[in-house]
Interface confidence: low
């Protein structure tokens, strides 16, 4: 036949290893490792007495051997000699040549051994058993599928630790990979399975497969003997090899007492849960008392600075020099320069309603027998009395993450009833770009420019460009009553030692281009937009009507530096939600408290001020907002 001549020619041409044509002797094998099974019974027409393959195995991916049964063949003469033929397949090839087993001896009786010269890891093999020229069994496989490593060797163990009660112990079991497994070069990557049991038990406990040659075994009972064994397999292919020799582990009794049953005293668990519980309680306490704790740690010390006077003079308490400076400018009684650069910012915190019934430090500073207003003091002074926020060290390093919110105005968060005040800077040079510039106050929701990296950016003002600047008061709902100047400015010190203070009120934010309506507008209207505001909850409750155009003369001294302006914005939504706050009082003007002299010096940190300049619609306006605290002024007071 032409085909046989072709095959013979190819074989003689030395292509036996390269040529991997194949015979379609494909056996259907179950998903279980076929190398441990006989051929599917459905494949056979011959009797079960005939020889059949039992297993093919490669211990190290470099050689393999196949074994078959030959139970009754020795005693029967009708069957010829059993021969094994093999062929190597290329998946594209159909025709092939069959070659006889290269070594019937090395792997033992009824076996064929393929050394490394006959083993190719990537090419599939087909093998068949023949007797008297007829095929009695056949299998096909790739070498990777039949990898079954030799057992791990040199098992040993060491004690890791013993439980507090002395009843249980942990051990570390170690072993070595089989000698013939080429682990170092990565030709074989073995995974190991450790099994252990008590000597008198029958069922082995299996641990998860691991890639290392050691593993801890936990919670073994002391005074018991254990058997440990390990087996390995080629990772991602092949089957587990034989188990190693059994390692016996005996754990001697180490405690003075023994227990029949397991006795667990979970000290660690108790400690962990205890610490966890204490931590939770501490957090709950801290969060519930957050504002009071803050007031204790950072008492309210806003620091107004005297315009035109070196703060070092104030710090050193040189009263004469201060008086001299102020006396020279006897005519200098300015209406408040709201664009003054020495204004200290004060962080505002809104208390929960239930906290307002308790007397705060601020209350104590302001209190007198006839003038206490606990329930109306809705804004706490969180200023720590540190240096001006315009100074670089605070700019760069002193902002707490909690004090700066993620790029959103408090106005846009009406659900937030309390929290830290956002510290923001509005660039008056850039006000034309701000959302307030083009938007009509009736429709535009105020928003704030978030400084890069959540840090306030100092921005210069343009106050020097105009000496007469109209402050167009834009109006908002009470939830945004956070942008109005209510600063007490020290404008003079009398020879008697009284400090004379002037009010200031001016809108430093971008002026709306939308025309203000001539009629009176209530404070409860949308988009009240004033910056640098410290506005009390008590004031917010009034919804005081305002005339739309209030002119404030700004007498700018050329000698004064126009420094950076910082504003704070804080949600005052507790006022926003209150009913009955929208009553209009036609014709009334915006009350501006005019603090003209010190009324009482209660403590080195607190000054109570008399308000005499303007009639107020309600006395509580003063009681809730009329105070200034300073750690500089106390040094120059008698």
């Amino acid at each position: 036949m032409d085909l046989w001549q072709l095959l013979l020619t190819l074989a003689l041409a030395g292509s036996s290893d390269a040529f991997s044509g194949s015979e379609a002797t494909a056996a259907i094998l179950s998903r279980a490792p076929w190398s441990l099974q006989s051929v599917n019974p459905g494949l056979k027409t011959n009797s079960s007495k005939e020889p059949k393959f039992t297993k093919c195995r490669s211990p190290e991916r470099e050689t393999f051997s196949c074994h078959w049964t030959d139970e009754v063949h020795h005693g029967t003469k009708n069957l010829g000699p059993i021969q094994l033929f093999y062929t190597r397949r290329n998946t594209q090839e159909w025709t092939q040549e069959w070659k006889e087993c290269p070594d019937y001896v090395s792997a033992g009786e009824n076996s064929c051994y393929f050394n490394s010269s006959f083993t190719s890891i990537w090419i599939p093999y087909c093998i068949k058993l023949t007797s008297n020229g007829g095929t009695v069994d056949e299998k096909c496989f790739s070498v990777d599928e039949i990898v079954q490593p030799d057992p791990p060797i040199a098992l040993n163990w060491t004690l890791l630790n013993v439980s507090l009660t002395g009843i249980h112990a942990d051990i570390q079991v170690r072993w070595e990979a089989p000698r013939n497994a080429d682990i170092q070069k990565g030709w074989m990557v073995l995974e190991y399975e450790l099994q252990y049991k008590e000597v008198n038990e029958t069922k082995w406990k299996m641990m998860d497969p691991i890639l290392t040659t050691s593993v801890p075994v936990y919670s073994l009972k002391v005074d018991k003997e254990y058997e440990v064994r390990v087996r390995s397999k080629q990772r991602n292919s092949g089957n587990y090899g034989e188990f190693s020799e059994v390692l016996y582990v005996t754990l001697p009794q180490m405690s003075q007492f023994t227990c029949e049953e397991d006795f667990y005293f979970p000290w660690l668990l108790i400690i962990i849960f205890g610490i966890f519980g204490l931590t939770v309680m501490l957090f709950v306490f801290l969060f519930s008392k957050q504002q009071r704790i803050k007031m204790l740690i950072l008492p309210p010390v806003p620091v107004p600075k005297i315009k035109g006077i070196d703060p070092d003079l104030l710090k050193e308490g040189k009263l004469e020099e201060v008086n001299t400076i102020l006396a020279i400018h006897d005519s200098y009684k300015p209406e408040f320069h709201s664009d003054d650069s020495w204004v200290e910012f004060i962080e505002l915190d809104i208390d929960e309603p239930d906290e307002k019934t308790e007397e705060s430090d601020t209350d104590r500073l302001l209190s007198s027998d006839h003038e206490k207003s606990h329930s109306n003091l809705g804004v706490k002074d969180g200023d720590s009395g540190r240096t001006s926020c315009c100074e670089p060290d605070i700019l760069e390093t002193d902002f707490n993450a909690n004090d700066i919110h993620e790029g959103t105005s408090e106005v846009a968060q009406p659900q937030r009833l309390k929290g830290e005040a956002d510290l923001l800077c509005l660039d008056q040079k850039n006000q034309n770009n701000s959302p307030y510039h083009d938007a009509c106050p009736a429709t535009q929701q105020p928003s704030v420019i978030q400084a890069e990296k959540n840090k306030p950016q100092p921005l210069p003002t343009e106050g020097a460009e105009s000496t007469h600047q109209a402050a167009h008061i834009q109006l908002s709902n009470p939830s945004s009553l956070s942008n109005i100047d209510f600063y007490a400015q020290v404008s003079d010190i009398t020879p008697a030692g009284s400090v004379v203070l002037s009010p200031g009120q001016k809108n430093k934010a971008g002026m709306s281009q939308c025309d203000m309506h001539p009629e009176m507008v209530s404070l409860c209207q949308e988009n009240f937009l004033m910056d640098n505001a410290y506005f009390c909850e008590a004031d917010a409750k009034k919804c005081i009507p305002v005339a739309p155009h209030i002119k404030v003369e700004s007498h700018i001294q050329p000698s004064l530096n126009q420094e950076d302006i910082y504003i704070t914005t804080e949600s005052l939504t507790t006022a926003a939600g209150r009913p009955g706050t929208g009553e209009h009082v036609p014709g009334s003007e915006m009350p501006v408290p005019d603090y003209t002299s010190i009324h009482i010096v209660q403590s080195p940190q607190g000054l109570i001020l008399n308000a005499t300049a303007l009639p107020l619609p309600d006395k509580e306006f003063l009681s809730s907002c009329g105070y200034v605290s300073t750690d500089q002024l106390n040094k120059i007071m008698p």
């Epitope: 085909l3 002797t25 056996a27 290329n90 594209q92 159909w94």
Partner: antibody, heavy 125, light 108 residues
Framework: EVQLVESGGGLVQPGGSLRLSCAAS????????IHWVRQAPGKGLEWVAY????????SYADSVKGRFTISADTSKNTAYLQMNSLRAEDTAVYYC??????????????????WGQGTLVTVSS | DIQMTQSPSSLSASVGDRVTITCRAS??????VAWYQQKPGKAPKLLIY???SLYSGVPSRFSGSRSGTDFTLTISSLQPEDFATYYC??????????FGQGTKVEIK
């Protein structure tokens, strides 16, 4: 996408010759085995010939030995069946098919997994 | 050469019927048997290879089995698109590849 396209069929007189082509695409032709299978009108399938592009080995059915020659041009990804001394009984639709050892879950099987659409060869006087 | 004897040569069945086609090899071919489906004017399509392995994309209602030299193709529930001619084929080299004569499945 694997595609096999036959061409070259037609009417030929007995004793004449014809060359069929099978243009392959979508797989590595250089390592492939191409078979020709024919089907006479109203009859069953009959395997004709086979070539291994890689090894260059060929095999033929007894009925066409000595008359048909199978070849392949790997540069063109094309297999050819040169048919000489055609007889009337060679009239059939000739299909080229890719032969492949399919391996899945320990099961091997050689089969024709992709076929061309066929080309009709009519041998008639 | 190995002969593949297919039976029946034709059969009539209804949609939903269980259909069985058998193929007997004249000698042992191991499991090297494939089954194909062919519709008129079209090329055959592979259904089963290695006697019982379902080729990818083939509906699971098709199955194959082997008992010695007898091979069976079963369609568990005949569908309208299953009416066609079915062929068995052995690839037990080094013999020439041979097909069965085909079984035509017709609508009853």
């Amino acid at each position: 996408e694997v595609q096999l396209v036959e061409s070259g069929g037609g009417l030929v007189q007995p004793g004449g010759s014809l060359r069929l082509s099978c243009a392959a695409s979508g797989f590595n032709f250089s390592y492939s085995s191409i078979h020709w299978v024919r089907q006479a009108p109203g009859k069953g399938l009959e395997w004709v010939a086979y070539i291994s592009s890689y090894y260059g080995s060929t095999s033929y059915a007894d009925s066409v030995k000595g008359r048909f020659t199978i070849s392949a041009d790997t540069s063109k990804n094309t297999a050819y069946l040169q048919m000489n001394s055609l007889r009337a009984e060679d009239t059939a639709v000739y299909y080229c098919a890719r032969g492949y050892w399919i391996y899945y879950q320990y099961a091997w099987g050689y089969a024709f997994d992709y076929w061309g659409q066929g080309t009709l060869v009519t041998v008639s006087s | 050469d190995i002969q593949m004897t297919q039976s029946p040569s034709s059969l009539s069945a209804s949609v939903g019927d269980r259909v069985t086609i058998t193929c007997r090899a004249s000698q042992s071919v191991s499991s090297a048997v494939a089954w194909y489906q062919q519709k008129p004017g079209k090329a055959p399509k592979l259904l089963i290879y290695s006697a019982s392995s379902l080729y990818s994309g083939v509906p699971s209602r098709f199955s194959g089995s082997r008992s010695g030299t007898d091979f069976t193709l079963t369609i568990s529930s005949l569908q309208p698109e299953d009416f066609a001619t079915y062929y068995c084929q052995q690839s037990y080299g080094p013999y020439p590849l041979t097909f069965g004569q085909g079984t035509k499945v017709e609508i009853k």
